[in-house]
């Protein structure tokens, strides 16, 4: 609700500074508050524009200040206007010279339709002139000079709404400058009635509150609050929720408060007089001191609050037993709340007695929209109202107000809401690598749209065309590996950023699609790699019978050990061998194979082979003769790798015998490095030669080795081991 208050300080202008302050209390007007001259009430007043400034002591308040030298230009009628959501509220007031010939009894006077009304002006200057009375600047009545009484009155025996207006009194020789003003407000309805046809009954508006003839609501005087104005504010406070404060040394002294019609103007509670600078007499309280304390049980009367009831008593006269009412207090509401756009459930928590009910707690948005609780609960000490805003957006940022209005009073607490835009990545994640069951992803979380800081990041993924929920993993690094994926499946990927606070999950960013590889077939079985020539190797395998209909082929990878030379060969799936050609002689090659369909298969173990040699093999090295007995001896040797050595020949003969009497032992397994010669003669000297053979020929021994067998009785000497052919 709009709470507009106009403070006229002081309405009687002397040579002191005077001002008008217009306050929008507890709400934020859509358009600026305006203060202007009320030409409807007084046509022929001063035309000078007003210097309206911001009141620095309040957030939503405007002020006009007249310095003492401008006193002559002040007389007249003024208004303050505020607007919210198409509804305008206008408050009117007047200023007049303190040295005027007449002074009004009150600045405004509110009466009900049909009331018997006397509008009175007190004569303060005696002149030998006729007195004249005007209404809204038009002459209505005069009193001959000899008959001008001390109290000049306009009598309206049966007041009607058309009687309302600004009445002014002066001597005929005077002018606007010497006029006194009072404004008559006539409620459209008779006493205690309201409504378009005035046939509804008003709520009791206590403490001189006034029933609004259009809505039936009470307009409470400054210093009282609540639905029926029964609750007194804290000392020196005013406004619909008593949250505005009079900053003067003596509180609200010298402040005339003007509220929307039909209230008009009055002093704050505890003060009276045209200038609101006179304290109430003992036994009186309230605005203009019009209320009389009739406290039961001899309770004390406070001029601001009325009867101060003892514990266990309540009511205006302390006439009711019960827990004394306690003004509601809003608790646990921070001054600033950061909210993520989306659903928002603000909570208003209040204490007081009686505890506020759900209909007594509201939330006002910055644009003036009033929200009612969606949920409500209360404990012994607190009422908790939970509101629901289904979609709060950044334009909703600003000052929100939690408002509590009970019979014990009203309180409002403004708090600032800052609505943040949820973050969303601008780019889709990138797929760096995939296999049949994994993918390596760069999540590309920056740049992003919306507000940070980013609290966490989620990588969301799911198979395309599956009615599965999105799965997600929390990620901390930009590069992440997704494991346990299904093979040969198209996946969707996106990134969701999360900012701090409830509901901080942003919308997922752009989607990237990728497909995992099929599960690879096993490698060919029975792989065998053999040299074929100096420049070819032959790889063979068992026939392949795949389980699916898919086309397949064998991929063979060969690489040289000595050189950085690699080649991959595709072999049709119906073949069982491949000749690896254009190789280098006497070179070692590593070969592996796999069976590929659309997906790549698993590699076999590495196979190693040398191409055939292009030169004679070198002589076996490290030739040793050991374990010599009377009839045997062990010969051992080593050979160099890479010369395609296919066999070793040991040639021996008794020394001195002819060449053609030698014995040749051919060892066709080149991996054997030891051989035992048997059937030798005891105590005999033998000449032993050893050759290596390859595809080119035999090696050339540089010298022969001598072996002498032992006599028959002697034990053998053990001279080392190695692989032995027996």
């Amino acid at each position: 609700a709009m709470d507009l208050i106009l403070i006229n300080s002081l309405p009687l202008v002397s040579d002191a500074e005077t001002s008008l302050t217009c306050i929008a209390s507890g709400w934020r007007p859509h358009e600026p508050i305006t203060i202007g001259r009320d030409f409807e009430a007084l046509m022929n007043q001063h035309q000078d524009p007003l210097e309206v400034t911001q009141d620095v002591t309040r957030e939503w308040a405007k002020k006009v200040v007249w310095k003492r030298e401008k006193a002559s230009k002040i007389n007249g009628a003024y208004f303050c206007e505020g607007r919210v959501r198409g509804e305008a509220i206008r408050i009117r007031t007047m200023k007049m010279r303190q040295q005027a010939s007449f002074l009004p009894a009150t600045l405004t006077m509110t009466v009900d339709k049909g009331d018997n009304v006397n509008i009175s002006f007190k004569k303060v200057l005696i002149k030998e002139e006729d007195a004249v009375i005007y209404k809204n600047g038009s002459f209505i009545h005069s009193v001959p000079r000899h008959e001008v009484p001390d109290i000049l009155e306009v009598h309206l025996p049966h007041a009607q709404p058309q009687d309302a207006g600004v009445y002014s009194a002066r001597y005929i020789g005077g002018n606007l400058f010497t006029s006194a003003f009072t404004r008559l407000i006539v409620r459209r309805c008779e006493a205690q009635k309201w409504g378009p046809e005035c046939n509804h009954l008003c709520t009791a508006c206590m403490n001189n509150g006034v029933c609004h003839e259009d809505t039936g609501e009470c307009i409470c005087p400054p210093g009282f609050m609540g639905r029926t104005c029964e609750k007194a504010c804290e000392l020196h406070t005013f406004g619909r929720t008593c949250k505005e404060r009079c900053s003067g040394q003596e509180g609200c002294k010298s402040y005339v408060f003007c509220l929307p019609d039909p209230y008009g103007c009055s002093c704050a509670t505890g003060w009276k007089g045209l200038q609101c600078n006179e304290a109430c007499h003992p036994g009186f309280y309230g605005p203009d001191c019009k209320l009389r304390c009739s406290c039961n049980n001899g309770e004390m009367c406070d001029r601001f609050q009325g009867c101060l009831c003892s514990p266990g008593w309540q009511g205006l006269q302390c006439e009711r037993e019960g827990i004394p009412r306690m003004t509601p207090k809003i608790v646990d509401l921070p001054d600033h709340i950061e909210v993520n756009s989306g659903k928002f459930n603000p909570i208003c928590k209040a204490s007081g007695w009686p505890l506020p009910t759900n209909e007594e707690m509201t939330l006002v948005k910055p644009d003036g929209t009033v929200l009612h609780p969606k949920d409500f609960n209360h404990t012994d000490h607190f009422s908790v109202a939970i509101f629901t805003i289904h979609r709060i957006l950044p334009p909703d940022s600003g000052v929100w107000v939690c408002s509590v209005n009970t019979v014990a009073g009203m309180v409002e607490k403004p708090f600032n809401i800052s609505v943040k835009v949820l973050p969303k990545p601008l780019n889709a994640p990138n797929v760096i690598d995939t296999g049949h069951n994994f993918a390596v992803i760069n999540i590309s979380s920056e740049p992003y749209f919306g507000d940070g800081p980013i609290k966490s990041k989620k990588l969301l993924y799911k198979p395309v065309n599956h009615y599965e929920a999105w799965q997600h993993i929390q990620v901390t690094n930009e590069i992440v590996t997704l494991n346990y994926l299904e093979p040969r499946t198209e996946y969707e990927l996106c990134v969701q950023l999360v900012r701090r606070g409830e509901g901080g999950e942003g919308h997922p960013g752009p989607v990237r699609r990728f497909t995992t590889a099929s599960i690879g077939l096993p490698p060919p079985r029975g792989l065998n790699l053999l040299p074929k020539s100096q420049t070819t190797l032959n790889l063979t395998w068992q026939p392949i019978f795949p389980s699916s209909e898919d086309d397949f082929y064998v991929e063979v990878e060969r690489r040289s050990v000595q050189k950085s030379d690699q080649q991959n060969i595709k072999v049709p799936g119906n073949l069982t061998s491949v000749l690896l050609n254009n190789l280098h002689p006497r070179e070692q090659y590593v070969v592996r194979a796999r069976v590929n369909t659309k997906a790549q298969g698993e590699w076999s173990e590495d196979l190693t082979a040398w191409t055939l040699s292009d030169i004679l093999p070198p002589q076996p090295e490290n030739i040793k003769i050991s374990n010599i007995t009377h009839s045997s001896a062990v010969i051992s040797w080593t050979i160099l790798d890479g010369y395609s050595i296919s066999s070793i020949t040991i040639r021996y003969k008794v020394q001195g015998k002819n060449e053609d009497q030698h014995v040749d032992v051919k060892i066709k397994n080149a991996t054997i490095t030891q051989y035992q010669l048997k059937g030798l003669e005891p105590e005999t000297a033998y000449q032993v030669d050893i050759f290596a053979e390859n595809n080119i020929g035999s090696s050339n021994p540089a010298f022969s080795h001598e072996l002498v067998t032992l006599p028959e009785s002697q034990a053998p000497a053990d001279l080392g081991g190695g692989k032995m052919l027996l």
Epitope: G86, E87, Q192, G195, P196, E197, N199, H200, L201, C202, T203, A204, M206, D214, T215, G216, E217, R227, T228, E230, P354, E359, V407
Partner: antibody, heavy 117, light 113 residues
Framework: QVQLVQSGGGVVQPGRSLRLSCAAS????????MHWVRQAPGKGLEWVAV????????YYADSVKGRFTISRDNSKNMLQLQMNRLRSEDTAVYYC??????????WGQGTVITVSS | DIQMTQSPDSLAVSLGERATINCKSS????????????LAWYQQKPGQPPNLLMY???TRESGVPDRFSGSGSGTDFTLTISSLQAEDVAVYYC?????????FGQGTRLEIK
């Protein structure tokens, strides 16, 4: 919580009288006007009477004028409806209610009146 | 007295669908001075008193879910339930308070289809 608790319903013969009561709690009863509304079986709502906060002003529906009297005792937080010369068409559930402006905000639980011979 | 007429008398709507209840007054309940419509809506469930939903034709009473909304001006008004829930099954009444005596519509029974 503000509550209105009703009592005094029952079966009564045509031409006889009955008094309904409505007790208010957690409400500054003396500050509010009070209404009576009734609902005949299977029918809609019909406003019956209203009384001002101080009991000075009372208004009645034409159908009950002269037979029903609305009253209140602010010292006891009590609202009453005295029903005389009852007719069969007065058979209804009777509700007391407090206004919020011109709408009726808080309702009693209702009390059943059956007028039958 | 101002007569209030509701339509339809009864209405069956599927869960989650929109329900619309109309109310017509025999004379305008719009007060030009403040541009307010003096109309209220109530919900009444079996065995319970009526419950205030709306006043000033479109101001939702506290605690009323925001799927309920009121619209219209002058003589023609509408109560809309944007997405019907099982707990919304009830009789709905409009009421004018432009002039005394306050008068109610005959009611609209809302059921689930």
């Amino acid at each position: 919580q503000v509550q209105l608790v009703q009592s005094g319903g029952g079966v009564v013969q045509p031409g006889r009288s009955l008094r309904l009561s409505c007790a208010a709690s957690a409400l500054t009863f003396s500050n509010y006007a009070m209404h009576w509304v009734r609902q005949a079986p299977g029918k809609g709502l019909e406003w019956v009477a209203v009384i001002s906060y101080d009991g000075e002003n009372k208004y009645y529906a034409d159908s009950v004028k002269g037979r029903f009297t609305i009253s209140r005792d602010n010292s006891k937080n009590m609202l009453q409806l005295q029903m005389n010369r009852l007719r069969s068409e007065d058979t209804a559930v009777y509700y007391c209610a407090t206004p919020k402006g011109g709408a009726l905000e808080i309702w009693g639980q209702g009390t059943v009146i059956t007028v039958s011979s | 007295d101002i007569q209030m007429t509701q339509s339809p008398d009864s209405l069956a709507v599927s869960l989650g669908e929109r329900a619309t209840i109309n109310c017509k007054s025999s004379q305008s309940v719009l007060y030009s001075s403040n541009n307010k419509n003096y109309l209220a809506w109530y919900q009444q469930k079996p065995g319970q008193p009526p419950n205030l939903l709306m006043y000033w034709a479109s101001t939702r009473e506290s605690g009323v879910p925001d799927r309920f909304s009121g619209s219209g001006s002058g003589t023609d008004f509408t109560l809309t339930i944007s997405s019907l829930q099982a707990e919304d099954v009830a009789v709905y009444y409009c009421q004018q308070y432009y002039s005394a005596p306050i008068t109610f519509g005959q009611g609209t029974r809302l059921e689930i289809k």
